[in-house]
Interface confidence: low
């Protein structure tokens, strides 16, 4: 009977800039799952006695638990679960509809640092010195999953990867995204976007690491051959990636049609719904095929751009061809041309 008291139980805290606080995710037989705060018969707004999660904090090499309850803003990953039975039991869980799930947050005390650490501790359990080399993507607070600054850890050494814009490294980026279980490489992030603009008041855990790596072999097929250690650079870029598995994705819906398979396209990304404005980068039907798929409809029958004679018509704009590639939406404040899409209805 799996519970968070078991020695082989695996958990991590995500969506924060610390391994000791965030949204609780657990590893069950088929991968990582976000735990809904409605689990174990609780209400989604109920706060628990945090001491019940002390084993989770211990396992993450953090201090005592400070709070256990709903996480502030939920970014629902692909898989979220509601569990039943005793608090902390994971032997009877079911997949939850993402829009019904409020994530469970846990905050543990940051570990006491007696001496400055040589590396940032890993996000879950601390590896043994013989642990294989591994990667970590560090997003800014509240930032995206599968987007951020790449850190490479080898044995007890860890740090960022120095990157020159002229480096021809497309194969490497694909390999890294793949290794991180984040799909394929989409684009490089500027450091501010990846969250590395350091604030002097930030905790030491998020100050730059004392080790830095340089790309040694951009065609490498195992991590130990990709990078070599260098003296940390005071200036220069570090490698920061956006991978195709980033979350939260833009969601779409069709409104104002005669069925769920036709209508004006609306989108959202963590906020409320707004009209999607037509974009010159999406003149092909690829974008609309994707929208139709998301509605669980058939392929695109037709799409037409509605006239934007109204200078006050507003909406959101995605500069990429597909919405799934759009890691952020821009606001269009006037002349937003809405798009009416008709998909094949699987249940006419």
């Amino acid at each position: 009977r799996l519970s968070w008291y078991d020695p082989d139980f695996q958990a991590r805290l995500t969506r924060s800039n610390s391994k000791c606080q965030g949204q609780l995710e657990v590893y069950l037989k088929d991968g990582w799952h976000m735990v809904c705060s409605q689990s174990w018969g609780r209400s989604s707004k109920q706060w628990e006695d945090p001491s019940q999660a002390s084993k989770v904090c211990q396992r993450l090499n953090c201090g005592v638990p400070l709070s256990l309850g709903p996480f502030l803003v939920t970014y629902t990953p692909q898989s979220s679960i509601i569990c039943y039975g005793q608090l902390g039991s994971f032997s009877n869980c079911s997949h939850s509809r993402n829009d019904m799930c409020h994530s469970l947050g846990l905050t543990c005390l940051e570990p006491q640092k007696t001496t400055p650490p040589t590396t940032r501790p890993p996000p879950t359990t601390t590896p043994e010195p013989t642990a294989p080399p591994r990667l970590q993507l560090v997003a800014q607070s509240g930032g995206q999953h599968c987007a951020g600054v790449v850190e490479f850890y080898s044995g007890s050494l860890g740090g960022t990867i120095s990157y020159e814009a002229q480096d021809k490294t497309q194969d490497l980026e694909n390999f890294l995204c793949n290794n991180l279980q984040c799909g394929s490489f989409l684009k490089h992030l500027p450091e501010t976007e990846a969250g590395r603009a350091q604030d002097p008041g930030e905790p030491r855990e998020h100050q730059p690491l004392p080790i830095q790596w340089k790309i040694q072999n951009s065609s490498c097929t195992s991590l130990e051959h990709c990078f070599r250690k260098i003296k940390p650079q005071k200036s220069g870029r570090v490698l920061a990636l956006l991978c195709s598995g980033f979350q939260p994705k833009v969601q779409s819906r069709l409104v104002g049609g005669s069925s769920i398979c036709e209508g004006t396209v609306e989108v959202r990304q963590g906020a409320q719904w707004a009209a999607l404005c037509d974009s010159s980068s999406a003149r092909s039907s690829l974008r609309w095929e994707e929208v139709c798929r998301e509605q669980q409809c058939g392929s695109v029958n037709s799409y037409r751009v509605l006239d934007a004679g109204d200078p006050t018509s507003r909406g959101l704009f995605c500069p990429h061809q597909k919405l799934s590639q759009c890691h952020e939406l821009w606001e269009r404040n006037s002349y937003c041309k809405k798009v009416f899409v008709t998909c094949q209805d699987p249940n006419p």
């Epitope: 924060s16 803003v73 800014q140 509240g142 930032g143 501010t192 976007e193 906020a271 409320q272 952020e328």
Partner: nanobody, 112 residues
């Protein structure tokens, strides 16, 4: 629930400066683009400036060269530095991200 609190408005003379701040509660701050908007009496609300997560900015023609938008992710704050203020900048100023409901705003009055 995301809360937005705008501040920094006031009464100034033409040519003077103001700095508006908007503090955001909620983890949504870091990964979303932010905008400053304004609404003058009897007019439509308009987008004044916006900034995306990468720090790229965009301004309404009427404020280009005079207003600067910036953000501080650590403080979860978005700023609007307004220089060389004109009478026509008088309005209630709001900060927001696409699709969110509006806060209270902060009044800016330019008068001699």
């Amino acid at each position: 629930q995301v809360q937005l609190v705008e501040s920094g408005g006031g009464l100034v003379q033409p040519g003077e400066s103001l700095r508006l701040s908007c503090v955001v509660s909620g983890d949504i701050f870091s990964f979303i683009g932010w905008g400053w908007y304004r609404q003058a009496p009897g007019k439509q609300r308009e987008l004044v400036a916006q900034i995306n997560t990468g720090g790229l900015t965009d301004y309404a023609d009427s404020v280009k060269g005079r207003f600067t938008i910036s953000r501080d992710n650590a403080k979860r704050t978005v700023y609007l530095q307004m220089n060389s203020l004109k009478f026509e900048d008088t309005a209630v100023y709001y900060c927001n991200f696409p699709g969110h409901s509006w806060g209270q705003g902060t009044q800016v009055t330019v008068s001699s």
